[in-house]
Interface confidence: low
């Protein structure tokens, strides 16, 4: 008789989730010599311990503390790039500009990027059928709590000038409900962070508007200013050229405004 299983609204745990996490950990620790001391089996055990046998709507930041401790990593606090709704370009940028880091360039962010996971209350099984959806089911689910936890820690670590890449093609360029808007903005430390510089990425080639004047950007500026952090904003009209010029800054076409 098949055991009754809670049906959630979101997709289930990513196929081969344990292998993926362990393999990513092993790969990351080899590529990043400063993290070679990390025992990936312990990392997986801590990751698993955060959600296995627990109700997937009752996960807390505390559940992830053993994993956070094992994944403690120092990144240059003045080289942090946050992003909202434009992950791919942000990652392409840090692949070229190797001294800057998104959350997914850190061990814990790299482990979980694009993955879904959840368990079931009182069983040691991983749920591959469905997991809670943030809106339709509950916000305290394993994936949402993980990203809230690591995003908060990442923002808290930032200093000097912090950059954020925002998607100018969206109706809300700055969205208060995004992880950036709801977590990271509020956890930048004013005593350490001097400026938040927003890069608004334009989608269309013909779009020459100044999206830094968008009402949602003004809202972001207001929130940041109230936190005693300076705000600046730049339009990136041609993201393809922007990346090209990051790769080849000596290129003559890169001396003009990008």
């Amino acid at each position: 008789v098949p055991r009754w299983r809670q049906q959630w609204s979101g997709p289930g745990t990513t196929k081969r989730f344990p292998e993926t996490v362990l393999a990513r950990c092993v790969k990351y620790t080899e590529i990043h010599p400063e993290m070679r001391h990390v025992d990936c089996q312990s990392v997986w055990d801590a990751f698993k311990g955060a959600f296995i046998s627990k109700h997937p709507c009752n996960i807390t930041e505390e559940d992830y503390q053993p994993l956070m401790k094992l994944g403690t990593q120092t990144v240059p606090c003045n080289k942090i790039l946050l992003w909202s709704r434009i992950k791919d370009l942000a990652h392409q940028f840090t692949q070229v500009q190797r001294d800057m880091f998104t959350l997914e360039d850190t061990l814990l962010g790299y482990l979980a990027d694009d993955l879904t996971w959840c368990g079931e209350f009182n069983t040691s099984k991983i749920n591959y059928q469905s997991c809670p959806d943030w809106r339709k089911d509950c916000s305290n689910n394993p994936v949402s709590v993980f990203w809230k936890t690591v995003s908060r820690r990442f923002a808290e670590a930032a200093c000097d000038v912090v950059h954020v890449m925002l998607n100018g093609s969206r109706s809300k360029i700055f969205d208060k409900n995004s992880t950036f808007g709801s977590v990271e903005v509020h956890n930048l430390q004013p005593e350490k962070v001097q400026t938040l510089e927003a890069w608004v990425i334009h989608g269309g080639r013909e779009d020459s508007r100044d999206l830094c004047q968008d009402p949602t950007i003004k809202e972001l500026e207001s929130i940041i200013s109230k936190r005693n952090i300076q705000f600046s904003c730049k339009n990136i009209y041609r993201p393809d050229k922007f990346l090209q010029c990051v790769k080849n800054p000596e290129d003559s076409s890169c001396t003009s405004e990008i």
């Epitope: 292998e19 092993v26 080899e30 089996q41 997986w44 099984k125 991983i126 591959y128």
Partner: antibody, heavy 125, light 107 residues
Amino acid sequence: QVQLVQSGAEVKKPGSSVKVSCKASGGQFSFYAINWVRQAPGQGLEWMGEIIPDYGVTHYAQKFQGRVTITADESTSTAYMELSSLRSEDTAVYYCARWSYTYGIRYYYKLFDPWGQGTLVTVSS
Amino acid sequence: EIVMTQSPATLSVSPGERATLSCRASQSVSSNLAWYQQKPGQAPRLLIYGASTRATGIPARFSGSGSGTEFTLTISSLQSEDFAVYYCQQYNNWPWTFGQGTKVEIK
């Protein structure tokens, strides 16, 4: 250092079943997949299937689908391979092998390592 | 399923000589290929994974190359303990499949 120790040789009648065990010692059992590979006398290696004990997922080669059942007992770090409806062509040495990940600078790899010592199953009337 | 074809079936080589074994996949397996050595009465032993990376403890005289569908295992100078059967295996797609083996024998 993980070692895989298999159960002893078996002689079985056609039509019956055999259950071979593979016990892991000296390392983490549940995460890694345990594979079963067989080798008929004088023949090559033939992959039968695998189990990932951590979440009970099994994959079987089509040739053995319906006849082979791979299970695992995490409490004893033991995997089992049961083959039913035995025929003389099933006479072979049955190996278990663990796959795990290792890594390079740009890639990570799946390895079949280590292997059990093998279990000879003879099917004869 | 992916069919792995090894050649030759038997290779006769004198000790100290070079041995070159081939393995062809019926479709691309990227670099997801391993080589094993098997001696009579023993379980296979992993030599090479990722097409070209030597497993722990494997002597430098063993080297692997290739990607996609064509792969080669080279033993630069055969020692007496190298006479055995060698198998290639792809782990790119289920089901994992092995070649039929190449027997390296003393000439």
